[in-house]
């Protein structure tokens, strides 16, 4: 007996589609072996029509696919545009058609119900709009027009040209009679309900000379689209509900165990707290379509999601909806990375951001999630070097360690930096991840002077003190610019014996600028790292002034946190619209910061440290 299981009998009608789900024991071998759908011929051979390796027969081209869900031990065969010729005996199976594990499926495609001659068929999703066309002859132009619904042997009046409207259709139906010369009237029914399904009769005039036309209205519940995403990754629900509801409030909800639908997010400002920090509702296009992005996917996010439109911002019968069934794959290609990173006021954090390693050339971004209204995520930094003005001197995006991970360093932390941040690229949108920064009690581990004023032409020495736990880490100084932080050349770091007992007096790494030039003004970072993995950093601003003359005043350099607040949509801002979430900027407002000058160059800058070991462990 084969352990593969599925539906023995599948029946459908011409023009429709089927979604055949086959179940298999999810052993490691089964999960990764070939899956197939084949048709049994008279000879007994089973000819492959579609397989998990990408094969699609010419007969199925453009209308069928096979999707494997390895974690659930299922695969789904979708076949659209069915015809009577598709009726027959099939197998869904694993391995090789002739001797693999398989299950027999019988597919029967029928013509559909017998309808009166000349019946027009209208197939529409629930909540949408249908326009029924009713032709008539010239002699019936002045006569009463009407639409009836056939219920059994009786006909129930739905609407007529004498202003009658059946109560079941109140406020959602209208009969339009065109100007002279056009021999057709139309009946428009909005916000279709399942109960509207059935056979209708258009009538113009009365008696034996009347015009009649049959219309078969099929109202369908929308098929949920199967969406299969990786744990920790991101999903985008694209919702296009039509122009009719372009100006109506939109929502995304999740169907619960009571079969009601809990709002996840809507355009009226409601948001489920379970999605805090990891959801955005994209601004609507002119056609009323919108999309919702959820990052940091969890197993408990699985379920049936509906998007829709209604003035209350929640699901109501008879309004258009779209449906998805979300599966979250625990065998994720997205590596684990901390979802919470903690830092202390005045200290720093180094955030590791995963990206699709096949897209090493993609642009990398980091944005700050803001929950107001539908959510937005203004970009703070990108790999091309643009940094928001108020983060000048304290934020950098590094390509290291590479191979699927980049690093974002934020220092000079304040309590205002607490919040949710998104890592993203201009490539694979499923690799968007969320990290929460929390500011906790404590002191920074690296100590540098608050502000330093250097004198032109003289020598400047800036100390950076570090605790014993960093004695084996690599220490560095770098000069910050909005394109990164350029490491300054190191000098001989002295004898290692001084660090065997972690001598109190020897725990410092110094930066020397000799001689000081105008180009040396700017932000400098002292940091620790292990290989390509960055730990803590501390920032110091160096102001450069002329030699003091009697009566001159000391000018304190601008501190990073004194930068002006971000202004929304002022002259220096460009509003970036996110078209179908292809643009990773996520409707950010960003400011472009001018480069902060040349890097400190050559032998003028040197780093001196009495440490010679590199430390293991993490500074986070």
């Amino acid at each position: 007996k084969s352990p593969v299981f599925g539906p023995q009998e599948v029946s459908s009608v011409e023009g429709n589609s089927v979604s055949i789900k086959c179940y298999y024991p999810p052993t490691s071998v089964n999960r990764h072996t070939r899956k197939y759908w084949c048709r049994k011929g008279a000879s007994g051979r089973c000819i492959t029509l579609v397989s998990s390796e990408g094969y699609v027969s010419s007969n199925y081209a453009g209308r069928a696919n096979l999707t494997n869900f390895p974690e659930n031990g299922t695969f789904v065969v979708n076949i659209a545009q069915l015809s009577r010729d598709d009726s027959g005996h099939y197998k869904c199976g694993l391995g090789i058609n002739s001797r693999g594990l398989s299950f027999d499926v019988s597919l029967e495609v029928s013509q559909g119900p017998e309808l009166p001659n000349g019946t027009e068929v209208y197939t529409v999703d629930v909540g949408r709009t249908v326009t029924i066309k009713c032709p008539f002859k010239t002699e019936n132009a002045p006569k009463t027009k009407a639409l009836y619904k056939k219920i059994g042997q009786t006909s129930v009046l739905v609407i007529d040209s004498r202003n009658y409207v059946n109560p079941n259709y109140k406020d959602r139906i209208r009969l339009r009679i065109p100007g002279t010369g056009q021999l057709i009237f139309t009946v428009v029914i909005d916000r279709l309900r399942l109960s509207d399904h059935g056979l209708y009769l258009c009538q113009a005039g009365d008696g034996s000379n009347r015009d009649e036309k049959n219309a078969d209205l099929q109202v369908l519940e929308p098929e949920p689209e199967l969406v299969y995403e990786d744990l920790r990754g991101s999903v985008t629900f694209h919702c296009a509900l039509g122009l009719e509801v372009a100006n109506v409030a939109k929502f995304l909800c999740r169907v619960n165990s009571r079969e009601t639908c809990d709002v996840v997010i809507n355009t009226l400002g409601k948001r489920d707290s379970a999605f805090e920090g990891r959801i955005l509702l994209n601004p609507q296009d002119k056609d009323g379509s919108f999309s919702v992005v959820i990052t940091g996917l969890r197993k408990e996010d699985e379920g049936r999601y509906l998007c829709g439109a209604h003035s209350d911002g929640q699901l109501q019968e008879g309004w258009p909806i779209q449906a998805w069934q979300l599966f979250v794959n625990e065998e994720s290609t997205i590596p684990r990375s901390p979802t919470v990173v903690k830092g202390v006021a005045g200290g720093s954090v180094a955030v590791l951001c995963p990206y699709n390693p096949k897209e090493s050339q993609s642009l990398k971004y980091w944005c700050l999630w803001e929950g107001a209204q539908n959510g937005r995520c203004p970009l703070l930094v990108e790999s091309q070097g643009l940094v928001q003005e108020q983060y000048e001197g304290r934020l950098s995006l590094l390509q290291e360690p590479g191979n699927g991970t980049f690093t974002v360093i934020l220092n000079q932390l304040t309590t205002q930096d607490a919040g949710f941040y998104w890592c993203l690229t201009n490539g694979d949108t499923r690799w968007r991840t969320t990290v929460e920064i929390k500011i906790i009690e404590g002191e920074p581990n690296l100590k540098v002077p608050g502000n330093v004023t250097a004198v032109l032409g003289e020598t400047l020495n800036i100390p950076c003190h570090f605790p014993c736990k960093f004695s084996s880490y690599e220490k560095y100084w770098c000069k910050w610019s909005n394109t990164g932080c350029q490491t300054l050349p190191s000098q001989d770091e002295g004898p290692s014996e001084a660090f065997v007992n972690c001598d109190e007096n020897s725990r410092l790494v110094s930066l020397t600028l000799n001689p000081v030039t105008r180009a040396d003004e700017g932000w400098y970072w002292c940091g620790v790292k292990q290989g390509h993995f960055y730990g803590e950093t501390a920032a110091v601003y160096v102001a450069v002034e002329e030699k003091k003359v009697a009566g001159s005043r000391y000018v304190s350099p601008a501190k990073a946190d004194a930068a002006p607040d971000e202004k929304v949509l002022d002259s220096g801002v460009r509003e970036i619209e996110n078209k179908a979430i292809q643009d990773p900027r996520l409707f950010a407002e960003e400011k472009v910061v001018a480069d902060t000058g040349d890097q400190a160059g050559g032998s003028r800058a040197s780093v001196d440290s009495s440490s010679s070991e590199e430390q293991g462990g993490s500074s986070k």
């Epitope: 299981f5 539906p7 459908s12 429709n16 589609s17 055949i20 179940y23 079969e259 069934q325």
Partner: nanobody, 127 residues
């Protein structure tokens, strides 16, 4: 409140036929899957047959032990389910339960794939 009510159970002779019916009320959505399970004395509840609806397509599932003898049918709009049983055997003796679920995900053979259950109807097949 959701209610599934089975009917049609009884005592029959081996090789006879019997038709079970199930009527659902209070289901908030039109159900997308309904199924039959059975439980014989001292045994675990086992899958018998199921029917799923999606759009204008219907999917029927059967346990190997009843394939060719039992036929499942139903009406999604009316929320009814039937099980036509032919060529009954003494080993078919059990309490038959009707089950329903609003969507059609999850293996239809597992009881966890259903949210609502009836009280059951007894079928006894004597030799």
């Amino acid at each position: 409140e959701v209610q599934l009510v089975e009917s049609g159970g009884g005592v029959v002779q081996a090789e006879d036929s019997l038709r079970l019916s199930c009527a659902a009320s209070g289901l908030p959505f039109s159900s997308s899957r309904m199924g039959w399970f059975r439980q014989a004395p001292g045994k675990e509840r086992e899958f018998v047959a199921a029917i799923g609806w999606s759009g204008r397509s219907t999917y029927k599932y059967y346990a190997d032990s009843v394939k060719g003898r039992f036929t499942v049918s139903g009406d999604n709009a009316k929320k009814t389910l039937d099980l036509q049983m032919k060529d009954l055997k003494p080993e078919d003796t059990a309490v038959y339960y009707c089950a329903a679920h609003p969507d059609y995900y999850g293996d239809p053979r597992t009881s966890g794939a259903y949210r609502y259950w009836g009280q059951g109807t007894q079928v006894t097949v004597s030799s």
